[in-house]
Amino acid sequence: NPGASLDGRPGDRVDLSCGGVSHPIRWVWAPSFPACKGLSKGRRPILWAAAAGAPTVPPLQPFVGRLRSLDSGIRRLELLLSAGDSGTFFCKGRHEDESRTVLHVLGDRTYCKAPG
């Protein structure tokens, strides 16, 4: 399973799914243009499963208010796209298995390299 590779525009919604991962426990994002969001390079956790109730979204991250679970766990997420979201989303399993979704947001390469 090669994972997903999705295209979208700011303002669109895309579904991120966790194909082939038996017990998803967290999602991690590696931005293509980290400086666009004032971030450093590398992967960062964006959501993880809670023991009970709603999944946990860290308060100081770019997806607050734009990311929601579409099922009772975190197997399927819906993301409202914003400029600078391009990157790879990893769904991590309890047994260190993972799936990945590569996201390209229209215009990010230009938007994120523009001065200011």
């Epitope: 399973n1 090669p2 994972g3 997903a4 590779s5 999705l6 295209d7 979208g8 525009r9 669109d12 919604r13 895309v14 579904d15 799914s17 194909g19 399927r76 390209h104 229209l106 215009g107 990010d108 390469r109 230009t110 938007y111």
Partner: antibody, heavy 119, light 107 residues
Framework: EVQLQQSGAELVKPGASVKLSCTAS????????IHWVKQRPEQGLEWIGR????????RYDPKFQGKATITADTSSNSAYLQVSSLTSEDTAVYYC????????????WGQGTSVTVSS | DIQMTQTTSSLSASLGDRVTISCRAS??????LNWYQQKPDGTVKLLIY???TLHSGVPSRFSGSGSGTDYSLTISNLEQEDVATYFC?????????FGGGTKLEIK
């Protein structure tokens, strides 16, 4: 009205290259992805690749990598497909089309350009 | 690459019939499935995107359904103008891939 107007039919010799054009009206190509799709005679549709015209970010089916090059000129609201080292396998109708992204399909298509490779 | 299979390459039906065209993906494509109509003159139009959403201007006799790897397009009341070839296409991962097409004719 959304329209994609493609250039006229081409008759080209083996080994040559051809550059096809696609001019958009009724929308700004910078706000969409532009795709190119190939259809050989009596065959199905094959996705060649797509470009984000705002940043010239192209992606291709690996089987067309090195064979096809997609470019765009946002000032003329046009996209282009160049096919190189032509052989009889490249004889086909080539369609340009637009998409807003994976969730929306390829929502408007050009009329197609016929390319015939013959000596 | 994800393979898209339309097992019926051609079918014939009568005016007014309900026709279903099926499409199978080689892996789960999470509903990123679109349907196109190609008329005999080569004109291509989007009918349905994201499994079941009707594109603007498409008659309501067209509908789509499915999930996972199995999808279908239904024409509920066949009309003469529906004579065409129908293609499914996945947008779940690159490269985007099409089914081989189903040619629909009137009996």
């Amino acid at each position: 009205e959304v329209q994609l107007q493609q250039s006229g039919a081409e008759l080209v010799k083996p080994g040559a290259s051809v550059k096809l054009s696609c001019t958009a009206s009724g929308f700004n190509i910078k706000e969409t992805y532009i795709h190119w799709v190939k259809q050989r005679p009596e065959q199905g549709l094959e996705w060649i690749g797509r470009i984000d015209p705002a940043d010239v970010y192209g992606r291709y089916d690996p089987k067309f990598q090195g064979k096809a090059t997609i470019t765009a000129d946002t000032s003329s609201n046009s996209a282009y497909l160049q096919v190189s080292s032509l052989t009889s396998e490249d004889t086909a109708v080539y369609y340009c089309a637009r998409s807003y992204g994976s969730s929306y399909g390829i929502d408007y298509w050009g009329q197609g350009t016929s390319v015939t490779v013959s000596s | 690459d994800i393979q898209m299979t339309q097992t019926t390459s051609s079918l014939s039906a009568s005016l007014g019939d309900r026709v279903t065209i099926s499409c199978r993906a080689s892996q789960d494509i999470s509903n990123y499935l679109n349907w196109y109509q190609q008329k005999p003159d080569g004109t291509v139009k989007l009918l349905i995107y994201y499994t079941s959403t009707l594109h603007s201007g498409v008659p309501s006799r067209f509908s789509g359904s499915g999930s996972g790897t199995d999808y279908s397009l239904t024409i509920s009341n066949l009309e003469q103008e529906d004579v065409a070839t129908y293609f499914c296409q996945q947008g779940y991962t690159l490269p985007w891939t099409f089914g081989g097409g189903t040619k629909l004719e009137i009996k």
